[in-house]
Amino acid sequence: ESALITQQDLAPQQRAAPQQKRSSPSEGLCPPGHHISEDGRDCISCKYGQDYSTHWNDLLFCLRCTRCDSGEVELSPCTTTRNTVCQCEEGTFREEDSPEMCRKCRTGCPRGMVKVGDCTPWSDIECVHKESGTKHSGEVPAVEETVTSSPGTPASPCSLSG
């Protein structure tokens, strides 16, 4: 996978595949779904299902489409103007501090706590103290402390625009 960079044969990106449409940049920028050519004179379309761009840009390359991991479902496919939208499978969720993986939702709250929020693709079940109503930290309790309950009804898929 190597190519000599030459004057005569600029970048292979400029030898566009048949599906790669070209247009001229507007004020130096290319529209969503395109990237700019090496000389800045052309806009070249991203490759459907492979890469994308979401905004007017002067990017040399379109961005690689995300591929959903195992344990995720694809809510919408990658297009030339929008990245893939992936969501954790039912019974799992994605935390802000570990966004690269879906974690299993807890099946119940610790003793003395009551469930007030269901497992969703973006949050674990939510537990509060019966008396005070304060939230539980989210640490998984020791097995013997766990009061099991059936997982909540799965949330309807969130609509993410991108």
């Epitope: 990106q13 990237h35 492979q50 990017l59 379109c62 690689r64």
Partner: nanobody, 124 residues
Framework: EVQLVQSGGGLVQAGGSLRLSCAAS????????LGWFRQAPGKEREFIAA????????YGVDSVKGRFTISRDNAQNMGYLQMNNLKPEDTAVYRC?????????????????WGQGTQVTVSS
């Protein structure tokens, strides 16, 4: 996060060749475009070459066209800059960078991850 470790610099005579390597670890290297920059003493950093995530698209500035080859091997998490017919004016510290893409002027798009840099000295 991506970590980049460079190797392959050194001292070479004018007209000679060097191959710079950029070894990636951490998050999926194949999601990122790879760029090469250089900075000569007392000069601004210069964007010289880039390659997209799958190696299909490449970019090079006029000063290195016909002499430098950019490539990558996603299976090995490696990026390369093959430099032939080196000139004294190529003397600089060379750094690789990984980013989602690069803008026409060389500015990384999104978070950029940088190699530590390697000295290339071309003697006349």
């Amino acid at each position: 996060e991506v970590q980049l470790v460079q190797s392959g610099g050194g001292l070479v005579q004018a007209g000679g060749s060097l191959r710079l390597s950029c070894a990636a670890s951490g998050r999926a290297f194949s999601n990122y475009a790879l760029g090469w920059f250089r900075q000569a003493p007392g000069k601004e950093r210069e964007f010289i070459a880039a390659i997209n995530w799958n190696g299909e698209n490449r970019y090079g500035v006029d000063s290195v066209k016909g002499r430098f080859t950019i490539s990558r091997d996603n299976a090995q998490n490696m990026g390369y800059l093959q430099m032939n017919n080196l000139k004294p004016e190529d003397t600089a510290v060379y750094r690789c960078a990984a980013a989602l893409s690069f803008r026409l002027g060389g500015e990384p798009y999104g978070d950029a991850y940088w190699g530590q840099g390697t000295q290339v000295t071309v003697s006349s």
